[in-house]
């Protein structure tokens, strides 16, 4: 799997050339560039950053750079009238307010279009009623609830703590339970790290920051008004009620400080347990309502932000491939941020950049791929990753049809621990390989691999001697190109140690003190994080590009099948006696399963035999290797969720951060004791491992020899 | 950790007005809520005007209701006191103290706060 054959070439330009040349100093100077004032989706600012990163790639030396705009629907709070939650005593009076901004951070001061803290896509409404405290509003903190506490949250207004699941998921489950209003809130049990700073001190979380964030039960289907289709010029919009994924009751955030006031005077139940506890020095009683003293107190939200259709603007690069036009590799990451964006996106776009240029400076010198890499900087991630599934929208039939894979690069740090990847099993020997190669920018890891370093921060918990490689779940722009289209795809970033750090994601996540000197003294001061984050994805993207075969290995998809058919069939064994009574077998999921590991074994086999010299034989036996993602996808997507297609893999139905194995067994299966019909929920277990051995044992003949 | 000077204070007639001013330093973005009290002599010390980190929420005792408005600069350096229509009885030693603690019955009430400036003396003569 040489990467030292496109044409026009000398030896030099292989991988080596093009690793050596990513430059830490580059990274760091690109973030600066990125971060000085705020990219929001939609906003002149970020229409301006774009032009400058089409300019810029042009400079670079990509073949072509162009701007794709749709009109999507976005959400922005009302200038003159902004949001708030209030306590109201028994005359109306509002005795307390939340805060109407985040005090900016030093040296911000004088920024203006700083958008105030808001739950993109909430509906108008002023409800006011009592509160009732509903932990992280998982679905299992409501089946806590309403099952075991017997407490009511029709009617109420429901406060939770961020954390997780996707905010999305928390606001549906409120919803389903009946609530009229959703509080989120930061904890700082989630989003303060014992013995660190607030900042501008360090990493923390202060009291008046707030995590923003859209509340899209989208499930894939991108820009609300236009689901399946991109929101071009001509497009036909649905009218707002009928618009995929909305809520529908009002949700604002706050900070601690304010969620203190609010939670201090909670009365009614206690909480359930010690999980159902933060770390602020209040009851975390459940509620509903107010103590004693404050029982006529009520809670009122005053919510006036309002949705619009607004252009957003991706930017699209192609690097042509020489000998491989048609087949094309796609590195993707957003350039929208909520204020600043010092790590989500911009210390992933910065990356992005220093790769364009690295390939850019190949280009220049007579080198190109063998195949085609286009880049991408996508618009409109926050707001549902509207920009990337607009675009995968207008171009499905050339992607699906020409798409190798899909390389996601969103923030490049959520920590300074070790790497974390998410991707196709189909990617898990490339990376194993690449990270072999590169240097470890760890302490106490000096002259080591970073697959060494990898395995030892972070083992694998099925295979000894090798890291932990995680299911993709959605919430980025990866989601269209793997959920819907099956183009194989991966995503890598250095994190936190996620043993001694339980608090979710990273405290300053979507606040206003997201800056550039946050990354800069606290996270990566030396950029070396990011430079390895670079080499990851940039390694990645050239071997996909630039290697004869493939670097794809459908073995390791054989193996990950196996387990998951293992886990889903003991989900259901928790149930035997319904699975006698209904007749409910695996046999055929664990067949298909059989066969594919046969035919893959033997695939591979022909794959280190063949003539490479052949070049039709070649494009052949990379077409079968291309196309095996796609085999495991469903024309007719997951049931109640048409855009979620990937019959082994989908965004959990309980939090779209995260991935499900055979997610349509997996749904059938989930409370199914509760179900009213259980003859018709069995029944719909039985449809689900029809369809998933059908789809396994269809991938595994696409393996198959031809004839 | 934070630290509080207070200025502007001075001898004025009834009917006149002053502003106070408390330039704060250190780990202000700890700072819950910030308060002006007052000290006549031989009385015990006495809120007269609070204000939250966000700016959000305000206290202003009723003996100085409609006179006297607090408020600070969008960077926390700095927390005022407008003082309108100043009466005999508003002379005293005037203290800006900052609050890291979120816990009261109400959300400016502090037992103690955290941290105290040397105070600026209003005088007003009849």
């Known amino acids: 799997k040489s990467s030292n054959e496109a044409t026009n070439i000398t030896p030099k330009h292989n991988m080596k050339a093009f690793l050596d040349e990513l430059k830490a100093e580059n990274i760091k100077k690109f973030l600066y560039n990125f971060t000085q004032i705020p990219h929001l989706a939609g906003t002149e600012q970020n229409f301006q950053l774009a032009k400058q990163i089409q300019s810029q790639w042009k400079e670079f030396g990509l073949d072509s750079v162009e701007l794709a705009h749709y009109d999507v629907l976005l959400s922005y709070p009302n200038k003159t009238h902004p949001n708030y939650i209030s306590i109201i005593n028994e005359d109306g009076n509002e005795i307390f307010n939340t805060s109407l901004f985040e005090p900016p951070p030093p040296g911000y001061e004088n920024v203006s279009d700083i958008v105030p803290p808001f739950s993109a896509f909430s509906p108008q409404g002023m409800p006011e009623g009592d509160l009732v405290y509903v932990n992280y509003a998982r679905t299992e903190d409501f089946f806590k609830l309403e099952r075991d506490m017997k407490i009511n949250c029709s009617g109420k207004i429901v406060i939770a703590r961020y954390g997780k699941v996707f905010r999305g998921n928390k606001v549906k489950n409120a919803q389903l339970a009946g609530a009229k209003g959703v509080i989120l809130y930061s904890d700082p049990a989630d989003y303060f790290a014992p013995g660190v700073k607030s900042y501008p001190d360090g990493w923390n979380l202060p009291g008046g920051g707030v995590q923003r964030g859209n509340i899209l039960n989208l499930n894939g289907a991108g820009d609300p008004l236009t689901p399946g289709y991109p929101a071009n010029e001509y497009a036909y919009r649905r009218g707002i009620a009928e618009a995929v994924g909305l809520p529908s009751i009002p949700v604002h955030p706050i900070g601690y400080y304010d969620a203190q006031k609010l939670l201090e005077k909670m009365g009614g139940s206690a909480p359930p347990d010690s999980s159902w506890r933060g770390s602020l020095k209040v009851p975390y009683n459940v509620g509903p309502g107010f103590t004693g003293n404050f029982s006529t107190q009520k809670v009122k939200m005053h919510i006036h932000s309002t949705n619009e259709v607004t252009r957003i603007y991706n930017v699209i690069g192609t690097l042509r491939g020489a000998v491989e036009p048609d087949r094309y590799v796609i590195l993707g990451g957003h350039r929208d941020s909520w204020v600043f964006g010092g790590i989500d996106p911009q210390s992933g776009a910065a990356v992005v950049h220093e790769i364009v240029r690295s390939f850019g400076t190949l280009k220049k010198e007579g080198w190109r791929p063998r195949r085609t890499i286009l880049f991408a900087s996508w618009d409109a991630e926050e707001f549902g990753l509207l920009g990337s599934t607009e675009w995968a929208e207008e171009n499905s039939r050339l992607l699906q049809e020409r798409g190798v894979a899909y390389i996601n690069a969103d923030s490049s740090i959520e920590g300074n621990y070790t790497l974390r990847v998410d991707c196709t099993p189909l990617m898990y020997s490339l990376v194993h390989n690449l990270t072999k190669e590169l240097k470890s920018p760890d302490e106490g890891f000096e002259g080591k691999s970073l697959y060494e370093s990898w395995t030892k921060k972070s083992p694998s918990p099925e295979f000894s001697g090798m890291p932990r490689i995680s299911k993709l779940g959605s919430g980025n722009d990866f989601e269209v190109f793997f959920q819907r289209l099956g183009i194989a795809s991966g995503r890598a970033r250095y994190t936190k140690n996620w043993e001694t750090n339980k608090f979710s994601g990273y405290p300053l996540y979507h606040s206003v003190y997201e800056t550039y000197e946050l990354v800069e003294k606290f996270y990566d001061p030396m950029f070396k994080y990011h430079l390895t984050v670079a080499q990851v994805r940039g390694g990645m993207v050239f071997e996909l590009a630039n290697s004869i075969v493939l670097p794809f290995d459908c073995r390791d998809y054989a193996v990950v099948l196996r387990k998951y058919a293992d886990k889903i069939y003991s989900i259901s064994m928790k149930h035997p006696q319904e699975m006698k009574t209904y007749s409910v077998s695996f046999d055929s999921l664990f067949s298909a399963v059989k066969n594919f590991t046969e035919i893959a074994s033997k695939f591979s086999e022909r794959l280190q035999d063949f003539d490479k010299s052949n070049p039709i034989v070649l494009r052949m036996m990379n077409d079968q290797l291309m196309f095996l993602e796609r085999a495991f996808i469903d024309p007719l997507g997951l049931p109640d969720r048409p855009f979620y297609r990937h019959v082994i893999y989908a965004p959990s139905s309980h939090n779209k951060y995260a991935g499900e194995s055979f997610p349509g067994i997996y749904d059938a299966l989930f409370d199914i004791e509760s179900k009213v019909d259980p003859s018709k929920a069995w029944g719909e277990v039985k449809r689900q491992i029809y369809v998933a051995a059908f789809t396994v044992q269809a991938a595994a003949e696409t393996l198959s020899e031809v004839a | 950790e934070v630290q509080l000077l207070e200025s502007g204070g001075g001898l004025v007639q009834s009917g006149d007005s002053l502003r106070l001013s408390c330039a704060t330093s250190?780990?202000?973005?700890?700072?819950?809520?910030m308060s002006w009290f007052r000290q006549a002599p031989g009385k015990e010390r006495e809120l007269v005007s609070a204000?939250?980190?966000?700016?959000?929420?305000?206290f202003h005792a009723d003996s100085v209701k409609g006179r006297f408005t607090i408020s600070r600069d969008n960077s926390w350096k700095t927390l005022y006191l407008q003082m309108n229509s100043l009466r005999p009885e508003d002379t005293a030693v005037y203290f800006c103290?900052?609050?890291?603690?979120?816990?009261?019955?109400?959300?400016?009430?502090?037992?103690?706060?955290?941290?105290w400036g040397q105070g600026t003396q209003v005088t007003v003569s009849s």
């Open positions: 103290a900052a609050s890291t603690r979120l816990y009261g019955t109400t959300w400016y009430e502090f037992n103690d706060s955290d941290y």
């Open positions: 250190g780990r202000t973005f700890d700072v819950y809520a």
């Open positions: 204000i939250d980190w966000s700016g959000s929420n305000k």
